[in-house]
Interface confidence: low
């Protein structure tokens, strides 16, 4: 799996999970989240050569097409596969609210 | 939806469905498929600016992050959303076989 266990241990130019810390205020301009101040969102990036973690038959076809026609702009892309929620604390007036924001943290990637 | 009805009628630089015809023999080197000789596979391509058909909360976060930090390589990518199968005819010896290859045709796209 193209997850932290594999990607963070290996230097990998192909599609893989990349570390990314997001500071809510600085990076997103969000001032409404009280805790946490930021989180390890991670992201997916890298090339998608033929058969590198292809998600569907179409992405396998596309990567093979791209191998034979390298000038074509039609190629698979490295995107998130498994995502996890993030629990946040914010306030409505003086009332604290705890909420779980779904699909906030990328855990693994795929070529799609 | 970023499908043919929208994308093929509009000149759209952002993430959208793009037409792509694939000839099995010429483009993939596949000689085993008897019929069809090729098919309209389509593909997804284009920029994913903030809130352009974002698939998940993470992709919305990433596109907002990319707006504020446009030099960062962390950005959502335009990938397939809905896919359809393709029915093919091939031979094992002299015996014709009809099979449905799943997820071969892209019908719509998303920013993920």
């Amino acid at each position: 799996a193209l997850d932290a266990a594999y990607c963070f241990r290996n230097v990998q130019d192909n599609c893989c999970l990349r570390p990314l810390y997001i500071d809510f205020k600085r990076d997103l301009g969000w001032k409404w989240i009280h805790e946490p101040k930021g989180y390890n969102a991670n992201f997916c990036a890298g090339a998608c050569p033929y058969l590198w973690s292809s998600d569907t038959q179409h992405s396998r076809v596309l990567s093979l097409y791209n191998t034979i026609n390298p000038e074509a702009s039609a190629s698979p892309c490295c995107v998130s596969q498994d995502l996890e929620p993030l629990t946040i604390l914010y306030y409505i007036g003086k009332t604290p609210k705890i909420e779980q924001l779904s699909n906030m943290i990328v855990k693994s990637c795929k070529c799609s | 939806a970023l499908d043919a009805a929208y994308c093929f009628r509009n000149v759209q630089d952002n993430c959208c469905l793009r037409p792509l015809y694939i000839d099995f023999k010429r483009d993939l080197g596949w000689k085993w498929i008897h019929e069809p000789k090729g098919y309209n596979a389509n593909f997804c391509a284009g920029a994913c600016p903030y809130l352009w058909s974002s698939d998940t909360q993470h992709s919305r976060v990433l596109s907002l992050y990319n707006t504020i930090n446009p030099e960062a390589s962390a950005s959502p990518c335009c990938v397939s959303q809905d896919l359809e199968p393709l029915t093919i005819l091939y031979y094992i010896g002299k015996t014709p076989k009809i099979e449905q290859l799943s997820n071969m045709i892209v019908k719509s796209c998303k920013c993920s």
């Epitope: 130019d13 599609c15 600085r26 990036a45 890298g46 090339a47 998608c48 190629s75 698979p76 892309c77 490295c78 995107v79 070529c111 | 630089d13 952002n14 284009g46 920029a47 994913c48 600016p49 903030y50 990319n66 707006t67 930090n69 446009p70 030099e71 960062a72 390589s73 962390a74 950005s75 959502p76 990518c77």
Partner: antibody, heavy 122, light 112 residues
């Protein structure tokens, strides 16, 4: 995929000048384009860029002295009030596509235009 | 604003020999690897050799090698050829400041 600068010429100090970078083979709504200059016999100097989304960013020394804007196929660099120190060859360069995401850069500028020479003299 | 300091010019190298050029940044580059190396010959625009600190651009000979992370980077040219005579620049990408990019002062390589 190529870029070409135009508009470089001899101008007198204080006369505004607009340089144009014409692109072909790619869309400006998918790529960020930078302006870089090089004074005669000197090194490269990053001026600023306009992102695929249309936001312009400038080096702190260039803020107020330059304005970057774009149309569907061109990126303009306006030198608001040229001085003799602005004499240089001006290049436009695209962020290279890294992996599958066209907005990625990793400080990789490729391709570049051939450059256009601006001479500021009284 | 970040300052990139390169090995003083000129650096002399013999054909077949090895030359190393250092590039030191006054602050960490983005993601510790937003560092590129360019080659420039008189009358020509710069040519991208290496990006992401160590990734070789397509078509660039493997004699060119980039290394380093954070604030300290090195370009090594092994088996130096006459055609390698040029000025080499490093460029760094930065987050959070208005100065998103900066170039080093350049290092001239003279081949004997």
């Amino acid at each position: 995929q190529s870029l070409e600068e135009s508009g470089g010429r001899l101008v007198t100090p204080g006369t505004p000048l607009t340089l144009t970078c014409t692109v072909s083979g790619f869309s400006l709504s998918s790529y960020t384009v930078n302006w870089v200059r090089q004074a005669p016999g000197k090194g490269l100097e990053w001026i600023g860029y306009i992102s695929y989304g249309g936001s312009a960013y400038y080096a702190s020394w260039a803020n107020g002295r330059f304005t970057i804007s774009k149309t569907s196929a061109t990126v303009d660099l306006k030198i608001t009030s040229p001085t003799t120190e602005d004499t240089a060859t001006y290049f436009c360069a695209r962020h290279m596509q890294v992996g599958g995401a066209p907005t990625g850069s990793m400080a990789a500028f490729d391709p570049w235009g051939p450059g256009t020479l601006v001479t500021v003299s009284s | 604003a970040a300052v990139l300091t390169q090995t003083p010019s000129p650096v002399s190298a013999a054909v077949g020999g090895t030359v190393s050029i250092s590039c030191q940044s006054s602050q960490s580059v983005y993601n510790n690897n937003y560092l590129s190396w360019f080659q420039q010959k008189p009358g020509q625009p710069p040519k991208l050799l290496i990006y992401g600190a160590s990734t070789l651009t397509s078509g660039v000979p493997s004699r060119f090698k980039g290394s380093g992370s954070g604030t300290q980077f090195t370009l090594t040219i092994s088996d130096v050829q006459c055609d390698d005579a040029a000025t080499y620049y490093c460029a760094g990408g930065y987050s959070g400041s208005s100065d998103k990019y900066a170039f080093g002062g350049g290092t001239e390589v003279v081949v004997k």
